[in-house]
């Protein structure tokens, strides 16, 4: 099977690397613009320079390109607890991250939120907190893991998963049905 190529990929594939086909004349290959710049005007003819201009403040291109406009710099999402690790430059987007003792939880490919690393109170650290993963805790006897926190078995209701972990204690628990509360 031949992979389907978009129009731009088809046009680019006819020219050597680092060049692209002139949109109005497919016999001309123009040199792509360097990162940090964008295409202002196509080259007028073979062997002639492409007119590339530097990206304006607040925009960037991170690779060689023939884009008509630079890309807007990303903004770190304060409501997600993100902080700016490095500012946007003409050739690199803003880098966002989390504070010390926090990890990134990705809700989607493009959306992460910063959460505090679990301290494993009433348990021990099985795996340390990583950039993109919370601490993995192992709970002491009489405690079970719920949302990565060690919770007392006295909070375990019979219909919850914790019944296996809290088996000796479960007979002492007064509540027999889980109402879904925590």
């Amino acid at each position: 099977l031949v992979p389907h190529l978009g129009d731009r990929e088809k046009r680019d594939s006819v020219c050597p690397q680092g060049k692209y086909i002139h949109p109005q004349n497919n016999s001309i290959c123009c040199t792509k613009c360097h990162k940090g710049t964008y295409l202002y005007n196509d080259c007028p003819g073979p062997g002639q320079d492409t007119d590339c201009r530097e990206c304006e403040s607040g925009s960037f291109t991170a690779s060689e390109n023939h884009l008509r406009h630079c890309l807007s710099c990303s903004k770190c999402r304060k409501e997600m607890g993100q902080v700016e690790i490095s500012s946007c430059t003409v050739d690199r987007d803003t880098v966002c991250g989390c504070r010390k003792n926090q990890y990134r939880h990705y809700w989607s490919e493009n959306l992460f939120q910063c959460f505090n690393c679990s301290l494993c109170l009433n348990g021990t650290v099985h795996l340390s907190c990583q950039e993109k993963q919370n601490t993995v805790c192992t709970c002491h006897a009489g405690f079970f893991l719920r949302e990565n926190e060690c919770v007392s078995c006295s909070n375990c209701k019979k219909s919850l998963e914790c019944t296996k972990l809290c088996l000796p204690q479960i007979e002492n628990v007064k509540g027999t049905e889980d109402s879904g509360t925590t």
Epitope: W107, S108, N110
Partner: nanobody, 122 residues
Framework: EVQLLESGGGLVQPGGSLRLSCAAS????????MLWVRQAPGKGLEWVSV????????YYADSVKGRFTISRDNSKNTLYLQMNSLRAEDTAVYYC???????????????WGQGTLVTVSS
Amino acid sequence: EVQLLESGGGLVQPGGSLRLSCAASGFTFANYTMLWVRQAPGKGLEWVSVISAEGRTTYYADSVKGRFTISRDNSKNTLYLQMNSLRAEDTAVYYCAKLNMKATNFKDFDYWGQGTLVTVSS
């Protein structure tokens, strides 16, 4: 075809509780972040709570924190919202939604259900 079907809404007195359910089909439920969003009469959509694909990470809007609990059962392809200490301002149509894989915020969902009405009134 993706389908999300909410149930469990109704009329409840202030301080009361309700448990909403959302049955999902037509996609691999266990692979996706899911959320509950709501729309109060005459207001815009407001996200309420979100839960990660495997169910270990949850997050709540300040307005419901400590009162609502989101959970999921991936073996049953079902999302839940336990609502306690309900207030008049919680009156809304509640929708369950699937977060887009490329989402840049909690309003970037690509599928949602028909909604279930929750009315909190004495």
